[in-house]
Interface confidence: medium
Amino acid sequence: GNLTVAVVLPLANTSYPWSWARVGPAVELALAQVKARPDLLPGWTVRTVLGSSENALGVCSDTAAPLAAVDLKWEHNPAVFLGPGCVYAAAPVGRFTAHWRVPLLTAGAPALGFGVKDEYALTTRAGPSYAKLGDFVAALHRRLGWERQALMLYAYRPGDEEHCFFLVEGLFMRVRDRLNITVDHLEFAEDDLSHYTRLLRTMPRKGRVIYICSSPDAFRTLMLLALEAGLCGEDYVFFHLDIFGQSLQGGQGPAPRRPWERGDGQDVSARQAFQAAKIITYKDPDNPEYLEFLKQLKHLAYEQFNFTMEDGLVNTIPASFHDGLLLYIQAVTETLAHGGTVTDGENITQRMWNRSFQGVTGYLKIDSSGDRETDFSLWDMDPENGAFRVVLNYNGTSQELVAVSGRKLNWPLGYPPPDIPKCGFDNEDPACNQDHLSTLE
């Protein structure tokens, strides 16, 4: 028989983690494995048909993606949709596929909304999702004794698909669910310095444990301004939500693992400011299969897609598409063996959910709602040399924090700052006022 996989991803723009130039080679490698393994879909041929999720400008589009999906559905009647990755593109496609009872498999669509499976039935996310970031942050808060207050800041940049809005939404909602905690959130425009000033005025009254989603440059600017305003001392901690670790990469950007460094005359101050900073990223898989997969992926991307893949965490997305597709094919194989058909979307999807799988990204666990458990890393600066390194990892499957042995979290006080100042945010603690009065008497 024939099994058709309908791809709805950006076909021209290579900048997205889920661009076809990146995911295509991963799909090729997965299908090559299917061919090579007699236990996967014996006697079947798997073919891919392509539709673009981007508009004429190469930007993800909530119009182009569903139109492409509809065209592919009527023309090819696919057994499964692969993608989209962008939130606004994936939302209408996911609603259509739910209506058609066709499985949708993606390693993108990380926003909180896709976890609502009555709306996005048969949507499986084999990649990371933002609510899972909330699980990590909640575990971190419990471990470090921060169970009362946090502040989340997120940047808005025109044309960036509101990545930070969705990230903070997932984080905010999950942390509030997991902990009985007050969480404030503020938006700011990256290109408007007056917004930064407003944030700095608000910060002292809203939080000491602060999460910031922004570009690396905006985060550095905020840290420099915070230092100037005296907010970078031992009482504050700033977490940069830099999930793909852009700020930690070399090449054209900042020096490897020195996210404060720019060579612009402000490095000394920036390094000092970054003593109060930590960075949260996805965890880079460290299993040997992943490294081997990356070698093949890069080679194939260059040979067949004329695309040079850079190193970095962004490669976990094509790798997750690869693992997700193999998991789907495994589920189809089992469904057929039990007398089902490739069009039995519900049965196939149920076989993918609440299941573990050994993939190129390592041990992969899809939860009971069809979302992958996600691993994260926390990076911290060694004050002696200014370099950031992973100090602890979060295992999404076991939901445990795993300290990297022999490495320490750096706290200027020697221990984490309290999430609420000793006298409260507005000096409202009567005991503090009492002390103050007694010194005047």
Partner: antibody, heavy 124, light 107 residues
Framework: EVQLLESGGDLVQPGGSLRLSCAAS????????MIWVRQTPGKGLEWVSG????????DYADSVKGRFTTSRDNVKNAMYLQMNSLRTEDTAVYYC?????????????????WGQGTTVTVSS | DIQMTQSPSSVSASVGDRVTITCRAS??????LAWFQQKPGKAPKSLIY???SLQSGVPSKFSGSRSGIDFTLTISSLQPEDFATYYC?????????FGQGTKLEIK
């Protein structure tokens, strides 16, 4: 009472193997990294290996890398040191110690609690 | 690896004396320095962590300080039970390393 108790030390021939155990009690075992340290007769202290609280991260001194393996069982509150291809220079008293990780309200205590040690002699 | 150079290797002192032992790291180790006391046939006992903080139950006659990569252990008034060997240890990063030890003997 917080306690660590090593066992498994013995006389063994060069090239042989031995497995040391460290039993912990009186504290939440999984909250602590665990360390093996050895002391050769009349000599100083040498860090041998460390394992994180969840067991997901281990590290070794160059002198034992590839020969020794540290593991832990957080259900049994125990840590182990599997020593293979033993050499005469591995002769020592082996101590296990705990080390706090991710402390909440204080600085890192370092290795605050040690066991009483178990003696390993490698000789033909 | 980070080298820890401890001095002196031995010191003779009398009961009631004040004794200072120093330790120098070959590179920066933040505040992650501990001091241990060891008596013959016994396990090391932690006295000080974080360069200057006393472990609980340790008498206040023991104190520690830091100046850059130089660390000091001071015992303010020696008692008979203080005669032992003292080690410094860095726990900034693996491999953890110890000083060679300072043997404190009764004069």
């Amino acid at each position: 009472e917080v306690q660590l108790l090593e066992s498994g030390g013995d006389l063994v021939q060069p090239g042989g193997s031995l497995r040391l155990s460290c039993a912990a009690s009186g504290f939440t075992f999984s909250d602590y990294a665990m360390i093996w340290v050895r002391q050769t007769p009349g000599k100083g202290l040498e860090w041998v290996s460390g394992i994180s609280g969840g067991g997901g991260s281990t590290d070794y001194a160059d002198s034992v890398k590839g020969r020794f393996t540290t593991s832990r069982d957080n259900v049994k509150n125990a840590m182990y040191l599997q020593m293979n291809s033993l050499r005469t220079e591995d002769t020592a008293v082996y101590y296990c110690a705990r080390e706090d990780q991710l402390p909440s309200y204080h600085n890192y205590y370092g290795m605050d609690v040690w066991g009483q040690g178990t003696t390993v002699t490698v000789s033909s | 690896d980070i080298q820890m150079t401890q001095s002196p290797s031995s010191v003779s002192a009398s009961v009631g004396d004040r004794v200072t032992i120093t330790c120098r790291a070959s590179q920066g180790i933040n505040n992650y320095l501990a001091w241990f006391q060891q008596k013959p046939g016994k396990a090391p006992k932690s006295l000080i962590y974080g360069a200057s903080s006393l472990q609980s139950g340790v008498p206040s006659k023991f104190s520690g300080s830091r100046s850059g990569i130089d660390f000091t252990l001071t015992i303010s008034s020696l008692q008979p039970e203080d005669f032992a060997t003292y080690y410094c240890q860095q726990y900034n990063s693996y491999p953890y390393t110890f000083g060679q030890g300072t043997k404190l003997e009764i004069k």
